[in-house]
Interface confidence: medium
């Protein structure tokens, strides 16, 4: 399997009750506006064929896409949570900037591309769904990167 390097986040990033709560509240607000409950972005299909040792790298890709293609364009919505959560997630992204995989990551890119395609296909409702799954993104980063 490909070897991942520098794919680690300090536990302290996930031990801040205030920002944890704000992240989950943002997800809740967005999920209330999400009518498409049959589609799941962060779930079994995203993780399929990706070992746990590669999972942090996978979640880094999802985090970067979510920030650049979803949260930044939607930054005026879901206040006051958005203005607090986006900088927090951006810091996590920055701390994972040196997280790379040595070897073939095609299987990971394929899974991430499916997520991206789903969000794009759904348009604005796809972006809302991605924000509504920030709790899963947060938990998956915690699970994979510590």
């Amino acid at each position: 399997a490909p070897i991942s390097s520098h794919c680690r986040l300090d536990k302290s990033n996930f031990q801040q009750p205030y920002i944890t709560n704000r992240t989950f509240m943002l997800a809740k607000e967005a999920s209330l506006a999400d009518n498409n409950t049959d589609v799941r972005l962060i779930g079994e299909k995203l993780f399929h064929g990706v070992s746990m040792s590669e999972r942090c790298y996978l979640m880094k890709q999802v985090l970067n896409f979510t920030l650049e293609e979803v949260l930044f364009p939607q930054s005026d919505r879901f206040q006051p949570y958005m203005q607090e959560v986006v900088p927090f997630l951006a810091r996590l992204s920055n701390r994972l900037s040196t997280c790379h995989i040595e070897g073939d990551d095609l299987h990971i890119q394929r899974n991430v591309q499916k997520l991206k395609d789903t969000v794009k296909k759904l348009g604005e409702s796809g972006e809302i769904k991605a924000i509504g799954e920030l709790d899963l993104l947060f938990m998956s980063l915690r699970n994979a990167c510590i």
Partner: antibody, heavy 121, light 110 residues
Framework: EVQLVESGGGVVRPGGSLRLSCAAS????????MNWVRQAPGKGLEWVSG????????DYAASVKGRFTISRDNAKNSLYLQMNSLRAEDTALYHC??????????????WGRGTLVTVSS | QAALTQPASVSGSPGQSITISCTGA?????????VSWYQQHPGKAPKLIIY???KRPSGVSNRFSGSKSGNTASLTISGLQAEDEADYYC??????????FGGGTKLTVL
């Protein structure tokens, strides 16, 4: 076939210690978060503790925090629960449980049959 | 984290539909889509029948369905069968990284 087999239960006096083990087979152990869940005789389920794939995050119910320690040895496909300062209310059948899919340990899709812990003087 | 609230018992006749409720708080059921349901027959280990509010594991009958509204999650069993008689537990993952279970509901098929 996924199999989880618990061991290490028994009768212990209040204040005593026990170490439970869970031997896992039939799946790639280090791809999954794992949990311990207990059930007192005739009572409901109570989550005790959970650990992520590499032991980096360990979470506990308030009722056992500071007394119990969860750990895992991925080379041995084993999960452990070290229980110290045991109390009568810790008496229960202790189940080892695996997440249904590897991204979410809290969806406990596979369970062992349990090992009985009795705390009594 | 307090236990989630479920009715102690429900009953129904074969072929009927029944619903079991699971009421939590804004810190668990109300906030996150991490609700699971388990079926437990006497002397057996629990079995996952619903996860992430409304997803069914492979092999679980489509007679079982889950939903959530506000702080309350629900499990509906349609076309009740004798083998559905069991204890049912809901659970929710929380923002404190813990899992909380409901007290359990005994389903009797009349």
């Amino acid at each position: 076939e996924v199999q989880l087999v618990e061991s290490g239960g028994g009768v212990v006096r209040p204040g005593g210690s026990l170490r439970l083990s869970c031997a896992a087979s039939g799946f790639t152990f280090d791809d999954y978060g794992m949990n311990w869940v207990r059930q007192a005789p005739g009572k409901g389920l109570e989550w005790v503790s959970g650990v992520n794939w590499n032991g980096g995050t360990r979470d506990y119910a308030a009722s056992v925090k500071g007394r119990f320690t969860i750990s895992r040895d991925n080379a041995k496909n084993s999960l452990y629960l070290q229980m110290n300062s045991l109390r009568a209310e810790d008496t229960a059948l202790y189940h080892c449980a695996r997440g249904w899919y590897s991204g979410a340990a809290w969806n406990m899709g596979y369970w062992g049959r349990g090992t009985l812990v009795t705390v009594s003087s | 984290q307090a236990a989630l609230t479920q009715p102690a018992s429900v009953s129904g006749s074969p072929g009927q539909s029944i619903t079991i409720s699971c009421t939590g708080a804004s810190g668990d059921v109300g906030a996150y889509n991490f609700v699971s349901w388990y079926q437990q027959h006497p002397g057996k280990a629990p079995k996952l029948i619903i996860y992430d509010v409304n997803k069914r594991p492979s092999g679980v009958s489509n007679r079982f369905s889950g939903s959530k509204s506000g702080n309350t999650a629900s499990l509906t069993i349609s076309g009740l069968q004798a083998e559905d008689e069991a204890d049912y537990y809901c659970s929710s993952y929380t923002s404190t990284f813990s899992v909380v279970f409901g007290g359990g509901t005994k389903l009797t098929v009349l």
